[in-house]
């Protein structure tokens, strides 16, 4: 309900005069001309519908706001000066003007802090016209006024382009404590000090501040807004809120909390996506962060082998993404692998160890002792070797593969031959007379084709040129395959 | 020779601290994680917490958090173990076992901790 | 926290017969499972990880089976010196746990 607070009333056409100084309730002001002397608005405009009953056409000399220039001078009526109210209250002021009746086409527009107020304000326009002038009533009211309708508000009025300016009236709406700044949740380092900033403002002013932590007020004075805490350093989480303190009561800021920064939490779920024979690729889950961003990790892997010794091998990768490729391992062995990640303040603990394993790899070795003869009888070249003496790592031998060149005369032509694992001899036959043929030999496993042996030459003769003598691989320390015709 | 060597035994009053250590040899200190497990009772074996003497990474077993902190001397390639507040429950024997990273392959000879007034 | 159940306390046996000794995890683990000997008066000593791969120097009629939430130490051809306590340990996750032990005793 809009309760009024005014001077007597005095019947029109007398408009009130100033009132003594300011305005203060705790219900809501308003300011409006009474009409309890029985005299009723002759016409209503909303402010979307100014103006009022022609009569007639009369030029109108140019108007300033420090005074109008006008016959008769115009000016709005004084009025109170300042409104204070609660917040959630309503409100109503006026401002009133005389004009006399050779003006027309009066607009009043409402403007608050030097802007207008346009759209779905409550502003009503009364007219009252007399035989000589029409007095305008200019009323403006708000429901629920909030902090944000405190300001200077003014009419002001057009008549045939020239503007008239009413004295401000100034709304205080006053309240809780409104925060400005309140306390920001904060990640600290274990004993090291650091700052909460709170700030509030009225009206009313002054604004007082407590601080509370974990529920416990900090400070036994308060201190006047802004304030700042420097809390000396925490060992454990800690709960901050601060308490804003005016005439019309106290308003708590939100709680915040304040981490204490640690080491992190172990990465879980570590996890194989991809194995070689030398390389595993893993991803991993990072663990809590400790309240301070992750800056790098670090992949520890042991072969598991019960006959070994085998040493650590560490691997610093950066922190994201959360995936690392561990190269230079040993083909078809066991690895225990475990990621640990470190923030600004340590090292977390290693994950729990996972268990990969390598695929097998090709052969690091070739075959031995290779030797190429002429069987011409046949027409064929007989080959002959060793096993390669390969490591467990390579896998099973599955078979060779058989590489022969064939040159003469400026053609050449490479063939390949593959042998099962059980032979340690082929026979390829002759391609072409009056050549030479390259021989190399490779071991494969499932893990790949391993290292060529050597070239081992030989030459074929044209057809009738009968020669037994072998070619082999060097004997080691040589420098070039011997070439035996 | 891998060799994990715990101090002797312990007769501490209740509401003291005491401190356990355990000097490896043989092997690379920084290389391997160093735990440290409880038996109760001749017989339950309970996991307290592991450090990495390379970073120092530390995870307790939340049971032992507060009651129990883990710290390293690199120079010395020593583990130790520090329990504070003992009361009678905490009398029993402790171990420091290196974390082969497959399971505990080595462990300390154990240490026998007594609380009482 | 995983719980590693041994539901035997006592196991009865004869030299020269075939035991097992069961663990079951209260959730999956894997493969990341050891098993440790303790005898009287001295430190648990590793005889298996990774479930199955037997440590070096440990004799091979210990052998270690099983994945998941189930597992198994066996000790075949027992011997006078096998008489101790059996402990299971799961590594797969943080905290680490222990079972409570199986004892091994001359019938």
């Known amino acids: 309900a809009i309760t009024e607070a005014r001077e007597e009333a005095k019947p029109y056409p007398l408009f009130p005069g100033p009132l003594p100084g300011s305005l203060q309730t705790d219900h809501t002001s308003l300011l409006s001309l009474p009409h309890t002397s029985g005299y009723q608005p002759a016409l209503m405009f909303s402010p979307t519908q100014p103006g009022r009953p022609y009569t007639g056409n009369v030029a109108i000399p140019r108007v300033t706001s420090a005074g109008s220039k006008l016959l008769p001078p115009l000016a709005f009526k004084h009025t109170v000066g300042h409104i204070i109210l609660s917040e959630h209250k309503d409100v109503k002021f006026n401002c009133s003007i005389s004009v006399p009746n050779i003006y027309q086409d009066t607009t009043i527009s409402w403007w608050k802090d030097g802007k207008e107020l346009l759209g779905a304000h409550h502003a009503i326009t009364q007219f009252y016209p007399d035989d000589e002038v029409t007095a305008i009533i200019a009323s403006f009211s708000i429901t629920s006024v909030q902090r944000s309708d405190n300001g200077s508000y003014i009419c002001k009025m057009k008549i045939n382009n020239e503007e008239i300016v009413s004295d401000p009236i100034y709304i205080e709406v006053q309240g809780l404590p409104h925060f400005t700044k309140q306390p920001e949740s904060m990640n600290v380092t274990r004993n090291t000090a650091f700052n909460l900033t709170c700030q509030a403002v009225g009206p009313p002013e002054p604004v007082n501040i407590f601080w509370v932590q974990n529920s416990s007020r900090v400070n036994e004075q308060p201190e006047k807004s802004p304030s700042v805490l420097t809390v000396p350093g925490l060992t454990e989480m800690a709960v901050f809120s601060c308490e804003a303190h005016n005439d019309k009561g106290l308003t708590v800021s939100k709680g915040v909390q304040i981490n204490i920064k640690a080491i992190p939490s172990p990465p879980t779920e570590v996890s194989i996506h991809n194995s070689t024979a030398h390389s595993i690729l893993i991803s991993w889950v990072p663990g809590f962060d400790g309240y301070s961003p992750f800056r790098n990790c670090s992949v520890q892997v042991k072969e598991v082998d019960p006959l070994s010794n085998g040493s650590v091998m560490i691997f610093n990768t950066s922190a994201s993404p959360h995936m690392y490729q561990i190269k230079q391992l040993q083909a078809l062995a066991n690895y225990s692998i475990g990621v640990s990640c470190m923030n600004e303040i340590g090292w977390s603990a290693v994950s729990p160890w996972i268990l990969a394993s390598t695929t097998e790899g090709a052969p690091s070795v070739a075959p031995l002792n290779v030797t190429v003869f002429l069987n011409e009888s046949r027409d064929n070249v007989d080959i002959r070797w060793m096993k390669p003496l390969t490591k467990r790592q390579a896998g099973e031998l599955v078979g060779y593969r058989i590489s022969h060149v064939w040159q003469s005369a400026g053609i050449s032509k490479e063939l390949l031959e593959e042998v099962g694992q059980n032979n340690s001899r082929a026979q390829i036959s002759v391609q072409v007379h009056n050549a030479t043929c390259t021989v190399r030999i490779a071991a494969v496993t499932k893990g790949g084709v391993g290292p060529f042996s050597d070239p081992v030459k030989i030459f074929i003769p044209a057809h009738g040129w009968v020669d037994h003598a072998p070619s082999s691989t060097p004997a080691p320390g040589n420098a070039d395959p011997v070439l035996i015709i | 020779e891998v060799q994990l060597q715990q101090s002797g035994p312990e007769l501490v009053k209740p509401g003291a601290s005491v401190k356990i250590s355990c000097k490896t040899s043989?092997?690379?200190?920084?290389?391997?994680?160093m735990h440290w497990v409880k038996q109760s009772h001749g017989k339950s074996l309970e996991w307290i917490g592991g450090?990495?003497?390379?970073?120092?990474?530390?995870i307790y077993n939340q049971k032992f958090k507060g009651k129990a902190t883990l710290t390293v001397d690199k120079s010395s390639s020593t583990a130790y173990m520090e329990l504070r507040s003992l009361t009678s429950e905490d009398s029993e024997v402790y171990y420091c076992?290196?974390?082969?990273?497959?399971?505990?392959?080595?462990w300390g000879q154990g240490t026998t901790l007594k609380v009482s007034s | 926290d995983i719980v590693m159940t041994q539901s035997h306390k006592f196991m009865s046996t004869s030299v020269g017969d075939r035991v097992s000794i069961t663990c079951k995890a209260s959730?999956?683990?894997?493969?990341?499972v050891a098993w440790y000997q303790q005898k009287p008066g001295h430190s648990p000593k590793l005889l298996i990880y990774?479930?199955?791969t037997r440590r070096t120097g440990v004799p091979d009629r210990f052998t270690g089976s099983g994945s998941g939430t189930d597992f198994t130490l066996t000790i075949s051809n027992v011997q006078s010196e096998d008489l101790a306590d059996y402990f299971c340990?799961?590594?797969?996750?943080?905290?680490?746990?222990f079972g409570a032990g199986t004892k091994l005793e001359l019938k």
């Open positions: 076992a290196r974390d082969g990273y497959f399971g505990f392959d080595y």
């Open positions: 043989g092997y690379t200190f920084t290389e391997y994680i």
């Open positions: 450090i990495n003497p390379n970073n120092l990474g530390i």
């Open positions: 959730q999956d683990v894997g493969t990341s």
């Open positions: 990774w479930t199955s």
């Open positions: 340990h799961q590594y797969n996750s943080y905290p680490l746990t």
